[in-house]
Interface confidence: low
């Protein structure tokens, strides 16, 4: 379920791009990082794909988006939103956010300077 964004102007083009790309590899990659490759994770069989492969697939997907910090932030916010309900405790939420903010650097592209990941109405 996608959240409603209250932003104005050309953020809609970013929303369309975020809608179009497949963020699941990014979500899987981050869950693998915070849970370890040997852990079972409910939503995916993460053991079937190495984390480095998931990272490359994630980067490939993010590659399809426009070269702006705003669009990258939109993507990170959407990943956070998608996984929020699956994060079991506060520590896991913080780990997820930390890994999420590292994601642009892992993919060798510019990280958004300001990106508010508290997007879930206080749930995360």
């Amino acid at each position: 379920m996608r959240r409603e964004r209250g932003r104005q102007g050309d953020s809609s083009s970013c929303e369309r791009q975020v809608d179009r790309v497949n963020l699941k590899p990014c979500e899987q990659h981050i869950m693998q990082r915070i849970m370890g490759e040997q852990e079972q994770y409910d939503s995916y069989d993460i053991r079937s794909t190495r984390s480095s492969d998931q990272q490359q697939r994630c980067c490939d997907e993010l590659n399809e988006m426009e070269n702006t910090q705003r669009c990258m932030c939109e993507a990170l916010q959407q990943i956070m939103e998608n996984q929020c309900d699956r994060l079991q405790d506060r520590q896991m939420v913080q780990q997820f956010k930390r890994e999420l903010m590292n994601l642009p650097q892992q993919c060798n592209f510019r990280a958004p300077q300001r990106c508010d990941l508290d997007v879930s109405g206080g749930r995360c």
């Epitope: 190495r50 480095s52 492969d53 990272q55 490359q56 980067c59 490939d60 993010l62 590659n63 988006m65 070269n67 892992q106 993919c107 060798n108 592209f109």
Partner: antibody, heavy 122, light 107 residues
Framework: QLQLQESGPGLVKPSETLSLTCSVS??????????WTWIRQPPGKGLEWIAS???????YYNPSLKSRVTLSVDTPKRQFFLRLSSVTAADTAVYYC??????????????WGQGAMVTVSS | EIVLTQSPATLSLSPGERATLSCRAS??????LAWYQQKPGQAPRLLIY???QRATDIPARFSASGSGTDFTLTIDSLEPEDFAIYYC?????????FGGGTRVEIK
């Protein structure tokens, strides 16, 4: 400064297998977002992408060559390899290895070897 | 598979003149287009990535523009060392393809 060096036989007989090695001068072969690539250029003609391999082994092939091409990578040795089977005179070309950047918004070949001329002839 | 068509095949100009090279993609490649220069006996050299961004150490006389299907490489004032073959290349998805090249020769 990263350097790439192709090596292999300069003459291959028709129907045999062409084998080339590309040696990478640093550890970037195991860096995420780089694909290690083979490109060829027949004499007097343009560039043709053959295939690209990621350090994990993920590989993409030119559809027109896929049935004859095998790519592999030896990360500890900083080398990657091309095998092209059942060669004909049409496979005579300069074969380049290159590093392909797959950074977000930067998809290009930024470092090239000097090229290895391979002639297919009996 | 995306096809890149370069035109003209040959461009005959004098040093100091402006060169305008075209690359047409079918279908669209967004901004995922690069340009290379190749001199005889040498490997290609990256000039432009992301349709318009100059690579490291590329002189300012080289510029490029375009997105989608139509792209242009411009060399503002040709230097003797600029006479070469120029290729465009895309990777909006796999497979990678190159254009057929434009030869810029001395008139």
């Amino acid at each position: 400064q990263l350097q790439l060096q192709e090596s292999g036989p300069g003459l291959v007989k028709p129907s045999e297998t062409l084998s080339l090695t590309c040696s990478v001068s640093d550890d970037s072969i195991s860096t995420p977002s780089y694909f290690w690539t083979w490109i060829r250029q027949p004499p007097g003609k343009g560039l043709e992408w053959i295939a690209s391999i990621y350090y994990t082994g993920t590989t993409y092939y030119n559809p027109s060559l896929k049935s004859r091409v095998t790519l592999s990578v030896d990360t500890p040795k900083r080398q990657f390899f091309l095998r092209l089977s059942s060669v004909t005179a049409a496979d005579t070309a300069v074969y380049y290895c290159a590093r392909y950047l797959d950074y977000v918004w930067l998809r290009a070949f930024d470092v090239w070897g000097q090229g290895a001329m391979v002639t297919v002839s009996s | 598979e995306i096809v890149l068509t370069q035109s003209p095949a040959t461009l005959s100009l004098s040093p100091g003149e402006r060169a305008t090279l075209s690359c047409r993609a079918s279908p669209s490649v967004g901004r995922f287009l690069a340009w290379y220069q190749q001199k005889p006996g040498q490997a290609p050299r990256l000039l432009i990535y992301d349709a318009s961004q100059r690579a490291t150490d590329i002189p300012a006389r080289f510029s490029a523009s375009g997105s989608g299907t139509d792209f242009t490489l411009t060399i503002d004032s040709l230097e003797p060392e600029d006479f070469a073959i120029y290729y465009c290349q895309h990777r909006s998805n796999w497979p990678v393809t190159f254009g057929g090249g434009t030869r810029v020769e001395i008139k």
